[in-house]
Interface confidence: medium
């Protein structure tokens, strides 16, 4: 969490941002909140990106003002206009690109004063893994697949019964470049699995950590997966 305060001149207002990560090709949110004003027409929101001389987005007098927007963001940004009055200056970024990573600044001007805060935005690709029993294999084998990751992640297997065991000798992981030549499909195979055990396939890069669990018993197979972003710090 980053909390920024105002600049010289008028009184300062508190602006708060949260570092976040964007998934390439999907929509992302750059979070920013500020001390609200009673009049929407008195609020100016400007989003800037370090190294980019044009604006990322501007909202003033109750509407978007995009004449100064940099071309790299054209048609890809929006604020939550109905929430600005309650102090939400968060920016929706459509179709996140790898090049969107960097330092952003949420700059607010209201009748109470000015304030700004920086936000570190990482970009990459991350997806939920799915673990299945590979019935085509000669021995009991598990196959963990996740369709989109970038940068290249690490894959680690764990099991509930053999806690602390190193499965690197009995697993094989491959990375296959996807058609857009940036993200990769992750496939990891675990051999010699035993029944009545829960196995976890953990995929991690510097942006996200995802886990796919599978519990194999004689009567059923249970699956569960979850994903966690690693760099959500507030400013």
């Amino acid at each position: 969490l980053i909390i920024g305060f105002g600049i010289s001149g008028r009184h300062s207002i508190t602006v708060t941002t949260v570092a976040s990560a964007g998934n390439i090709g999907e929509d992302g949110i750059l979070s920013c909140t500020f001390e609200p004003d009673i009049k929407l027409s008195d609020i100016v929101i400007q989003w800037l990106k370090e190294g980019v001389l044009g604006l990322v987005h501007e909202f003033k007098e109750g509407k978007d003002e995009l004449s100064e927007q940099d071309e790299m963001f054209r048609g890809r940004t929006a604020v939550f206009a109905d929430q600005v009055i309650v102090g939400n200056a968060s920016l929706r970024l459509k179709n996140v690109q790898l090049t969107d990573a960097g330092t952003y600044k949420c700059y607010i001007i209201t009748s109470k004063g000015k304030g700004n805060a920086n936000l570190e935005y990482k970009t990459g690709a991350f997806s939920m893994p799915e673990v299945n029993v590979d019935y085509n294999a000669s021995s009991e084998t598990l196959r963990c697949e996740a369709p989109r990751w970038f940068p290249q992640p690490t894959v680690v297997w764990a099991s509930q019964v053999d806690q602390g065991a190193n499965f690197s000798e009995v697993s094989n992981t491959s990375f296959e470049l996807n058609s857009e030549n940036v993200t990769m499909k992750v496939v990891s195979v675990l051999y010699n699995v035993t029944i009545n055990n829960t196995y976890s396939c953990m995929i991690e890069n510097d942006i996200a950590k995802a886990t796919g669990d599978i519990k194999v018993t004689e009567s059923e197979i249970k699956r569960r997966s979850h994903l966690q972003l690693l760099n959500s710090k507030a400013s």
């Epitope: 044009g54 940099d70 700059y107």
Partner: antibody, heavy 120, light 107 residues
Framework: QVQLVQSGAEVKKPGSSVKVSCKAS????????ISWVRQAPGQGLEWMGG????????SYAQKFQGRVTITADESTSTAYMELSSLRSEDTAVYYC?????????????WGRGTLVTVSS | EIVMTQSPATLSVSPGERATLSCRAS??????LAWYQQKPGQAPRLLIY???TRATGIPARFSGSGSGTEFTLTISSLQSEDFAVYYC?????????FGGGTKVEIK
């Protein structure tokens, strides 16, 4: 109405440095990019670098990298361009310009220019 | 960096006549091009941006066209105040670069 007011003419010796100022009046300064463009006598225009004052970090043309420093003081709404290791070919009019229109890529607002003469 | 080439270097035109100035980019700059006018002892003034959009307060006799690598500035009927040097500038790829200029003089 925003105006860019530049500092006066300078005469400098080769090897020395010059610092030119550009004060913005009548509008928001912090989030508007300011660029520096120079023009040698009888020559064309040459972009040197630019800065967004609120960020404080500048980007420079490769030709001037290491020799030019662009800074901004938000409290006085003033941008500065310092050029070091001056040589005779640095004799030029130095303009500050503010990006306007279409993503701030175009220089819609200019200062009147500062003549810097480098002579021994 | 992108090299901008303007032609001709000097254009002699009589008042009331049409003037056509050319600007060529060494690679495509899409429509991210501007035209500036500069008179002796003055700062440049933005005439046209985005290849064909007139800046605020610019008379309709100035028009811009083109995209990619070939661009044209046309002054439909030259007035006495139009005799000046004209520069094109690309802003498609950083750093922005200017052409060498075309001087429009009285014939």
């Amino acid at each position: 109405q925003v105006q860019l007011v530049q500092s006066g003419a300078e005469v400098k010796k080769p090897g020395s440095s010059v610092k030119v100022s550009c004060k913005a009046s009548g509008g928001t300064f912090s989030s508007y990019a300011i660029s520096w463009v120079r023009q040698a006598p009888g020559q064309g225009l040459e972009w040197m670098g630019g800065i967004i004052p609120i960020f404080g970090t500048a980007s420079y043309a490769q030709k001037f990298q290491g020799r030019v420093t662009i800074t901004a003081d938000e409290s006085t709404s003033t941008a500065y361009m310092e050029l070091s290791s001056l040589r005779s070919e640095d004799t030029a009019v130095y303009y500050c310009a503010r990006q306007q229109y279409d993503g701030r890529r175009y220089f819609g607002l200019w200062g009147r220019g500062t003549l810097v003469t480098v002579s021994s | 960096e992108i090299v901008m080439t303007q032609s001709p270097a000097t254009l002699s035109v009589s008042p009331g006549e049409r003037a056509t100035l050319s600007c060529r980019a060494s690679q495509s700059v899409s429509s991210n091009l501007a035209w500036y006018q500069q008179k002796p002892g003055q700062a440049p003034r933005l005439l046209i941006y985005s290849a064909s959009t007139r800046a605020t307060g610019i008379p309709a006799r100035f028009s811009g066209s083109g995209s990619g690598t070939e661009f044209t500035l046309t002054i439909s009927s030259l007035q006495s105040e139009d005799f000046a040097v004209y520069y094109c500038q690309q802003v498609n790829v950083w750093p922005p670069t200017f052409g060498g200029g075309t001087k429009v003089e009285i014939k």
